[in-house]
Amino acid sequence: HNTTVFQGVAGQSLQVSCPYDSMKHWGRRKAWCRQLGEKGPCQRVVSTHNLWLLSFLRRWNGSTAITDDTLGGTLTITLRNLQPHDAGLYQCQSLHGSEADTLRKVLVEVLADPLDHRDAGDLWFPGESESFEDAHVEHSISRSLLEGEIPFPPTS
């Protein structure tokens, strides 16, 4: 899997999208997990609704939300009030039984707030030693979802 980089500004919201094949993953719940080390486990942060038909309902764990457009095949994760410690490697997953398929590997980078005049030196950025040769950057512009943007699945 290539790694997609999403950059957000500290204190703002970052929206991460993970596209997938809606037919292949039909009926499957999804999850957002944080990679603990390069070879370590992926620790679950938040997962979609227990009832797959209600996957469109936004589920929160702390400042992280997840919602799934099961018809269009897009999983959306929102990291609210982004903080330096949110930077790191994550995965979007499709769950089946006790197994999990990786939909997308995501590197979250936290940029200093340009309006914040404090020393930006305490912001953590992924080190040069981490190799993401295949990574491509998606600049995610922070904004609130407009009414009607939350997608819905079919129900029968």
């Epitope: 009832l51 309902l57 009414e147 819905f152 699945p153 079919p154 129900t155």
Partner: antibody
């Protein structure tokens, strides 16, 4: 601001059908789930079923399966709940509710009183 | 189906007092529980979702807690407008179900 406006009160005979409407304004109608909940006089709330307008398909509580039909007309941003083979115990206030973000019941219509009496 | 049992059925309190309402599920609903307030002649209003998150515009005196089978809605200091019926609701399993309600009345 999301608003749900329901049709007026109905008086029906046992064995007949009733169709209650719920017109939505604010936001994109096709992107929201609409549910129907009823409340008999002095009683609690009972989920009947719901629809995702973009797909036009509905989910029903087993208790109402075969007797209730929930539909939506995107062109008029209106959802409908039709209940057939009415009996006196169907006398209740029928509410439509719409998801906005968090639950299936983020915002509610004002309710429609349906009285079943011979 | 999951049965939600609310207790007490009626709670008689005075303005300014603390109200503690209970909702017990017949089996685990994880954190998939919401609380609604309903006043006479009105539609219900969402107060709490996901067991502990306040809905937009809901005053801080309302708080929810619990997970699994036992949940609590707390109103820290009752205001005159808080006297109403409160319902819990789960959507962890089909069908979606509501509790029987707790009426909070003025003592």
């Amino acid at each position: 601001q999301v608003q749900l406006v329901q049709s007026g009160a109905e008086v029906k005979k046992p064995g007949s059908s009733v169709k209650v409407s719920c017109k939505a304004s604010g936001g994109t109608f096709s992107s929201y789930a609409i549910s129907w909940v009823r409340q008999a006089p002095g009683q609690g709330l009972e989920w009947m079923g719901g629809i995702i307008p973009i797909s036009g398909t509905a989910n029903y509580a087993q208790k109402f399966q075969g007797r209730v039909t929930i539909t939506a007309d995107e062109s008029t941003s209106t959802a409908y709940m039709e209940l057939s083979s009415l009996r006196s115990e169907d006398t209740a206030v029928y509410y439509c509710a719409r998801t906005q973000e968090y639950t299936l019941f983020d915002s509610w219509g004002q309710g429609t009183m349906v009285t079943v009496s011979s | 189906e999951i049965v939600l049992t609310q207790s007490p059925a009626t709670l008689s309190l005075s303005p300014g007092e603390r109200a503690t309402l209970s909702c017990r599920a017949s089996q685990s609903v994880s954190s998939y529980l919401a609380w609604f307030q309903q006043k006479p002649g009105q539609a219900p209003r969402l107060l709490i979702y996901d067991a502990s998150n306040r809905a937009t515009g809901i005053p801080a005196r309302f708080s929810g807690s619990g997970s699994g089978t036992d949940f609590t809605l707390t109103i820290s200091s009752l205001e005159p407008e808080d006297f109403a019926v409160y319902y819990c609701q789960q959507d962890y399993h089909w069908p979606i179900t509501f509790g029987g309600g707790t009426k909070v009345e003025i003592k």
